[in-house]
């Protein structure tokens, strides 16, 4: 009679974490008499996974009924597979012996690889806000995947980014892996509504990549532009001066009016108008009683935006005899002289 062969038909199998793995093994003869054992690995350090005759293996069940007299199928099913179960499994036939069974023949082995999905990518931006034209770094992290091969891409508003560095850890063998990537993004004034997206593709995701996003609204600070103008009013001894605060983000803003360097009024921006690009505008006005002033008046609009150092714009009111015209200051720099009604 032909000598018994141990047949493991699958050279390798791949199983998703959490599922069951079926390891196939058949023998070609009922002789010699003796048990089958399953091992993970080979050599003196191999690990017993299942012993037909003794032991308690709660995660292992046999596919066939081993008590049947002519059974030649010694396949096993391992439940609730985790990445730690990866390895090469050998089905080994033992010959009955005394006092111990003697190893008779081994199958060629089945390599079990475990697929584990990456966690949802988490994107984080810089701790402090930055202004347009500055370059900021975003990080993306995803963990717990197996096998190691993975693809990561960065996008800003649908446009793929190229300035990034990615590492998969550990460099050596592991039951599961992590990916860490850092992308550099140049901010523009239009980025309040922009998004940075980290996209991770892995064999376990069946072509449907995972995405993590960060809103640039949490990263960008657009400083305001200031314009101080003088408006005519009906009352001849009053001048209405407005301070237009334009195109700023975020909303947090405090404005102070100064008359000749002395604080006249402080207010916090409340009723803002939002621009299409996500920035805000705000206007504050100051009614100046010109008759109360003998000399020219320097009016300063001072704005503190998002805790940053104050920026200001000044406007000079010329206190002169019965002017007929009014002017406005629309240019930065030293205040322009403007006629004001007395």
């Amino acid at each position: 009679e032909e000598e018994l062969q141990v047949i493991q038909p699958d050279k390798s199998i791949s199983v998703a974490a959490g599922e069951s793995a079926t390891l196939h093994c058949t023998v070609t003869s009922l002789i010699p008499v003796g048990p089958i054992q399953w091992f993970r690995g080979a050599g003196p350090g191999r690990e017993l996974i299942y012993n037909q005759k003794e032991g308690h293996f709660p995660r292992v069940t046999t596919v066939s009924d081993l008590t049947k007299r002519n059974n030649m199928d010694f396949s096993i099913r391992i439940s609730n597979i985790t990445p730690a179960d990866a390895g090469t499994y050998y089905c080994v036939k033992f010959r009955k012996g005394s006092p111990d069974h003697v190893e008779f023949k081994s199958g060629a082995g089945t390599e079990l690889s475990v697929r584990a999905k990456p966690s949802a990518p988490v994107v984080s931006g810089p701790a402090a806000r930055a202004t347009p034209q500055h370059t900021v770094s975003f990080t993306c992290e995803s963990h717990g995947f197996s096998p190691r091969d993975i693809t990561l891409k960065w996008f800003k508003n649908g446009n793929e980014l190229s300035d990034f560095q990615t590492n998969v850890d550990p460099a050596g063998d592991s039951v599961s892996y992590s990916i860490h990537s850092t992308a550099k993004v140049v901010l523009t004034r239009e980025d309040v509504h922009s998004q940075v997206i980290c996209e991770v593709a892995h064999v376990t995701l069946q072509g449907d990549p995972l995405r993590g996003t960060a809103n640039l609204s949490e990263t960008i600070r657009v400083p305001p532009t200031l314009e101080v103008t003088q408006q005519p009013v009906r009352a001849e001894n009053q001048v209405n001066v407005t301070c237009q605060v334009r195109k700023f983000y975020p909303q947090r803003l405090q404005l102070t009016w100064l008359e000749n360097g002395n604080v006249s009024r402080t207010e916090t921006a409340s009723t803002l108008t939002e621009n299409k690009d996500g920035t805000y505008n705000w206007m504050s006005w100051l009614l100046v009683n010109v008759s109360a002033h003998r000399d020219d008046v320097k009016l300063t609009c001072q704005v503190e935006h998002d805790g940053q150092p104050a920026v200001s714009k000044s406007h000079d009111l010329k206190v002169s005899a019965h002017p007929k015209e009014q002017g406005s200051n629309t240019a930065p720099g030293p205040a322009l002289a403007s006629a004001a009604p007395l």
Epitope: G41, A42, G43, P44, G45
Partner: antibody
């Protein structure tokens, strides 16, 4: 292909601890045994011990009390620590990969590092 | 421990001629599965050992076919069909059936 590179001090004082690291590049730690073998000057090969990828260790009985082999799969490295060294531990130390295909035995030490000379002297 | 004994310890050879080295183990290296856990290594001068033969008779990858291994149980032979100048060095047999792994004392092959 797989390459092994030993690193560590070339000179160790008597009674101190010898520490060597072997870095595995170009291949996987899994399914292999990772061995340390030494060769005293002008003599033959002496097996010190090995570690399997699952962390199980095996040592030369005469060295067992002084030797620890450990594995860091995340760095693709394994290490040898030998305490209380004497002049008799002066040797070229090799790290090597041992294959295991099936069964209880092993299938040859198929990849060797270039060896690092360790001298025990005060 | 399994003791490995080689002979001869020194072997002068002539290039182009055959050569043979013997190795004996203190217990059988033929396992119950029919596999022989005996390996042969060559250590060229100033180099690390390299695996020539494993499993008693299987040539390792890249090893020229002039090297062959034979034997079973406790007696083994390494044959070089036609010695070449690059074959000089020390040949070791080693057993891989059980720990500790053990090696023969080595056979030094040199050109006459």
């Amino acid at each position: 292909q797989v390459q092994l590179q030993e690193s560590g001090p070339g000179l160790v004082k008597p009674s101190e601890t010898l520490s060597l690291t072997c870095t595995v590049s170009g291949g996987s730690i899994r399914d292999y045994y990772w061995s340390w073998i030494r060769q005293p000057p002008g003599k033959g090969l002496e097996w010190i011990g090995f570690i399997y990828y699952n962390g199980r260790t095996f040592y030369q009985s005469s060295l067992k009390s002084r030797v620890t082999i450990s594995l860091d799969t995340s760095k693709n490295q394994f290490s040898l620590k030998m305490t209380s060294v004497t002049a008799a531990d002066t040797a070229v130390y090799y790290c090597a990969r041992v294959r295991a295909y099936s069964g209880i035995g092993l299938d040859g030490t198929d990849v060797w590092g270039q060896g690092t000379t360790v001298t025990v002297s005060s | 421990d399994i003791v490995m004994t080689q002979s001869p310890l020194s072997l002068p050879v002539t290039p182009g001629e055959p050569a043979s080295i013997s190795c004996r183990s203190s217990q059988s290296l033929l396992y119950s599965t029919g596999y022989t856990y005996l390996d042969w290594y060559l250590q060229r001068p100033g180099q690390s050992p390299q695996l020539l033969i494993y499993g008693g008779s299987s040539r390792a990858s890249g090893v020229p076919d002039r090297f062959s291994g034979s034997g079973s149980g406790t007696d083994f032979t390494l044959k070089i069909s036609r010695v070449e100048a690059e074959d000089v060095g020390v040949f070791y047999c080693g057993q891989a059936l059980q720990t500790p792994l053990t090696f023969g004392q080595g056979t030094k092959v040199e050109i006459k």
